[in-house]
């Protein structure tokens, strides 16, 4: 399928068929206009002028967004000003503010906890399979296989630290070389960026919010994919990461450090360990071909154990496996040897929910997956709602200005680098890039942070997670210290190299452009977001994995034509946009291809046909939940509970009624008034800070 699917259909010049297209103003209230006053509540009555168009049909069919959809929404204030409040109102407002802050922190806490539980759930569902990926002997010779294994394992266990620690233990026990481990680390870097992309999916209800959130999340994906695209071949050719890190490691005078500080985990662990506790050694053991581990459960049952060393008679497959020739014998049936066995005596059981259920790992995993996704989704919705009610007026302006404004000239270029440091610092504090980028996603969605600012923060997050790994490596035991430090440094320098590639020169900030492109497509066709997730994180890696197992000839035989087609399409696309005259008439657009190969419209129709039956019940459920939510939060009566329903919005669009879905921070009364339904917001529930 050709990239940028809808561009082929776009009109080259809107001004030819739409009068005054260039001068049409966005619909915004004029602050200077008079306002009617009812019950001390200001309801702005807006007078605006829609310029005439020659064909409303054309407007609906080919919507022209004069506003840049990537401009941050104006976070408007619909409450009573602080100066106009009486003492009681001011006290009420302060308490309301404190309450909101507590709620925000509470939901943020459960949001982070649910991410932790989500990771555990993924490990229970796919951890053992992920461990088996590592036991594939072809990793040594095939860096591409190593890369996709890194992606798949990290996606399955939802934790790059788990996959990295498996790699470290494999390198430490000589099952893997550092050279073979580097592509896996690169893959782990890609895999970890799925978490915030999943979080972005939770904001699918509002198109413009989803556009920003999804682009903000996928900027991380694109950065990682592009970095690998360039740096993996460079590493295979030059082994620069291996060489540089080896030099650094060899210059170190080793002394085991203190344990890496657990900062955020100190707060979240007491809660998450009541839900489930995992024995993460099992995945590592499976990766290291330990047959006994395959039957072990990942769910930790005993938390307090006493380990005793004892000599035991154990059976071995042959005499060659004996600990020493003098300690080998037979009982007439089996061959025996004497081994030092660590005998583990169970003392105290763990205190989590699943400790006495004895359910299979898959069952526990699925239960936790559903619960954690529901909690994650719920927390996210509530965080967005609370932020939406808090970030208004001057507060919003201050925050937006602080975060998104550059330093004064000539230091403007430094702002991004400061953002990288902030991202690294914050990630170091929360000890997880997933947590940091996932917390960033809703903020991008609601328009507090621009994608341009989110990008360096995300890059910083990538650096932050590697500094945590370096600290953890320095605290690791002697036998794994060298390998874990070298791998952590490889991870660090890989991210540094990526930043040097895709950040310093504004022109090279491709991930932003690609993420915005994907955001635009996903906002129009929301199913495409899931499609993207499946293709990039599952389908492509699994295909490469399968082809790699089939051997180099098959991988090259399939890969070369695919890569050739992609390059051809990209070159054509570049020529079409930059210098179409060079191309023959037929190749100046994608119309020579069947519609399904250059537009998502036909695919949308097919998918809508399949998803149609599920939309109504889903929509009703969404409305009910939203109403309950509104009652709990004390939202105004005009709360848009139908915004998550496509049928209302798209049904009207189909009938030729242009619908402007209100933005999260639009002044609701204006939107209502435009539809002839003016309602005064409840003054009790609206509170403007400052």
């Amino acid at each position: 399928m050709a990239p940028w699917p809808e561009l082929g259909d776009a009109q080259p010049n809107p001004s030819k068929y739409l009068e005054g297209a260039t001068s049409q103003q966005p619909i915004t209230p004029d602050k200077s206009k008079e306002t009617n006053k009812t019950d001390n509540t200001e309801v702005p009555v807006t007078k605006f002028e829609l310029l005439p168009t020659y064909s409303t049909a054309t407007l609906i069919e080919e919507p022209t967004e004069v506003d840049d959809p990537w401009n941050l929404p104006t976070l408007q204030d619909s409450g009573i000003k602080w100066s106009e409040r009486d003492a009681k109102g001011k006290i009420l407002c302060v308490f309301q503010g404190i309450g909101r802050l507590i709620l925000l922190l509470g939901f943020l806490y459960f949001f982070v906890c649910s991410l932790d539980v989500l990771s555990s759930a993924f490990q229970l569902v796919g951890g053992k399979m992920a461990g088996q990926f590592f036991s594939n002997s072809s990793i040594m010779s095939n860096p591409l296989l190593g890369l996709v294994i890194g992606v798949l394992v990290t996606v399955f266990v939802q934790s790059s630290s788990t996959s990295t620690s498996i790699v470290v233990s494999m390198v430490a026990s000589s099952l893997l070389t550092v050279r073979a481990a580097i592509p896996i680390i690169m893959g782990a870097n890609i895999g970890t960026s799925i978490t915030n992309t999943i979080v972005a999916l939770m904001q699918v209800g509002d198109r413009s919010e989803f556009r920003r959130a999804f682009a903000g999340a996928t900027v991380h994906d694109f950065f990682n994919w592009l970095s690998v695209l360039v740096l993996l071949p460079v590493e295979v050719a030059t082994h620069y990461l291996e060489v540089v890190t080896q030099l650094i490691v060899e210059s170190f005078h080793f002394k085991n450090g203190e344990d890496a500080p657990d900062l955020l985990k100190v707060i979240t662990k007491p809660f998450t360990k009541l839900i489930v506790q995992l024995d993460k050694k099992v995945i590592s053991q499976i990766a290291m071909n330990d047959e006994t581990a395959k039957n072990k459960s990942l769910v930790k049952i005993w938390c307090k154990t006493f380990t005793n060393m004892t000599q035991m008679n154990v059976t071995v497959p042959s005499m060659a496996n004996c600990t020493s020739p003098s300690l080998c014998w037979t009982d007439g049936i089996q061959i025996w040897t004497m081994k030092n066995v660590t005998y583990k005596e169970n003392i105290a059981k763990c205190q989590h929910i699943f400790v006495n259920f004895h359910l299979p790992d898959l069952a526990v995993g699925i239960i936790l997956l559903i619960i954690s996704l529901l909690v994650l989704c719920g927390c996210l919705i509530m965080i967005v709602k609370i932020l939406g009610s808090v970030l208004k007026g001057q507060v919003a302006t201050v925050i937006k200005k602080t975060i998104n404004t550059d330093f004064p000239f000539p230091f403007a270029w430094l702002t991004g680098y400061l953002a990288i440091l902030v991202g690294a610092g914050m990630t170091f504090i929360v000890q997880s890039s997933s947590v940091f980028t996932s917390a960033l996603t809703p903020l991008i969605g609601i328009g507090v942070i621009t994608i341009e600012r989110a990008y360096p923060l995300t890059l910083g997050s990538n650096i932050g997670t590697t500094t945590t790994a370096i600290l953890a490596a320095l605290a690791s035991p002697g036998n794994t210290l060298r390998s874990s430090l070298q791998i952590a440094l490889c991870h660090f320098f890989f991210n540094i190299s990526g930043i040097l590639l895709w950040y310093p020169i504004p022109f090279t900030r491709l991930p932003i452009r690609m993420a915005k492109g994907l955001g635009n497509i996903s906002a129009k066709y929301r199913w495409f977001a899931i499609f993207y997730l499946i293709i990039f994180f599952f389908l492509i890696p699994l295909t490469v994995f399968g082809l790699s197992l089939a051997g180099w000839p098959v991988l090259v035989g399939v890969g070369v034509p695919v890569v050739f087609i992609i390059i051809l399409v990209l070159c054509l696309r570049l020529l079409q946009s930059r210098c179409p005259r060079v191309l023959p008439k037929k190749l100046q657009n994608w119309n020579f291809l069947p519609l399904c190969m250059h537009s998502l419209k036909p695919w949308d129709a097919v998918i809508s046909k399949f998803t149609g039956p599920f939309q109504m019940p889903c929509c009703c459920c969404c409305r009910v939940c939203c109403r309950v939510c509104c009652l709990l939060c004390g939202c105004p009566k005009c709360c848009r509970c139908s915004k998550c329903c496509q049928d209302l919005e798209e049904g009207q669009e189909a009938q030729g009624v242009p619908v402007k879905a209100p933005e999260t921070f639009d002044n609701i009364t204006i939107s209502r008034e435009a539809q002839g339904e003016v309602r005064a917001p409840d003054s009790k529930t609206e509170c403007t800070a400052l």
């Epitope: 003098s326 014998w329 037979t330 061959i335």
Partner: antibody, heavy 119, light 107 residues
């Protein structure tokens, strides 16, 4: 106390088969391997093979692989050895002996069954 | 197969004497050697296992020694009831093999 009971003697014709028993008592039959040993005046002691009554797993001396078949009945706590295509060379005393798992020695022996192959 | 060789078919001794019965393995068997005593008309009885460990109830005049390929069963202060055949056996590998036996005679 541990006891291994074997029939005292068996008289068989050449070419025929014999199935001798070894009834165990005084211990958990499935927890110990049952070994079979042949003793002739010319050859001394020869190990025939072993059976693990719990799993039914067997192991044979290559010299007896065709000649002997070891079985065990968990219900009656009895081990059996069948000798086929008997010749005069098979005339000997056959002992069953008990060995614990991971022990290659026999602390308990049956009284032995004297097999006489004669026309 | 590992061959266990007992070089002396017969050994003659007097009551109260000390006698050493030897057994040689065709290859290294570590300590995986057992000694049995068989009196006429009886089944073999376990004396020593792991080359030097006395079985329960065996008098301490019986001692085993050796490792690798050379093993010895020593009977100090021989008694008349010690008149019997003595067999060594290796349990290092399958098949388990026995020595041809040494007959102890009392003068």
């Amino acid at each position: 106390q541990v006891q291994l009971q074997q029939p005292g003697a068996e008289l068989v014709k050449p070419g025929a088969s014999v199935k001798m028993s070894c009834k165990a008592s005084g211990y958990t039959f499935t927890s110990y391997n049952m070994q079979w040993v042949k003793q002739t005046y010319g050859q001394g002691l020869e190990w025939i093979g072993a059976i693990s009554p719990g799993s039914g797993e067997t192991s044979y001396n290559q010299n007896f692989k065709v000649k002997a078949t070891l079985t065990a009945d968990k219900i009656s706590s009895t081990a059996y050895m069948q000798l086929s295509s008997l010749t005069s060379e098979d005339s000997a005393v056959y002992y069953c002996a008990r060995a614990a798992r991971a022990e290659g020695w026999f602390a308990y022996w049956g009284q032995g069954t004297l097999v006489t192959v004669s026309a | 197969d590992i061959v266990m060789t007992q070089s002396h078919k017969f050994m003659s001794t007097s009551v109260g004497d000390r006698v050493s019965i030897t057994c040689k393995a065709s290859q290294d068997v570590g300590h995986a050697v057992v000694w049995y005593q068989q009196k006429p008309g009886q089944f073999p009885k376990l004396l020593i296992y792991w080359a030097s460990t006395r079985h329960a109830g065996v008098p301490d005049r019986f001692t085993g020694s050796g490792s690798g390929t050379d093993f010895t069963l020593t009977i100090s202060n021989v008694q008349s009831e010690d008149l019997a055949d003595y067999f060594c056996q290796q349990f290092r590998s399958i098949p388990l093999t026995f020595g041809s036996g040494t007959k102890l005679e009392i003068k």
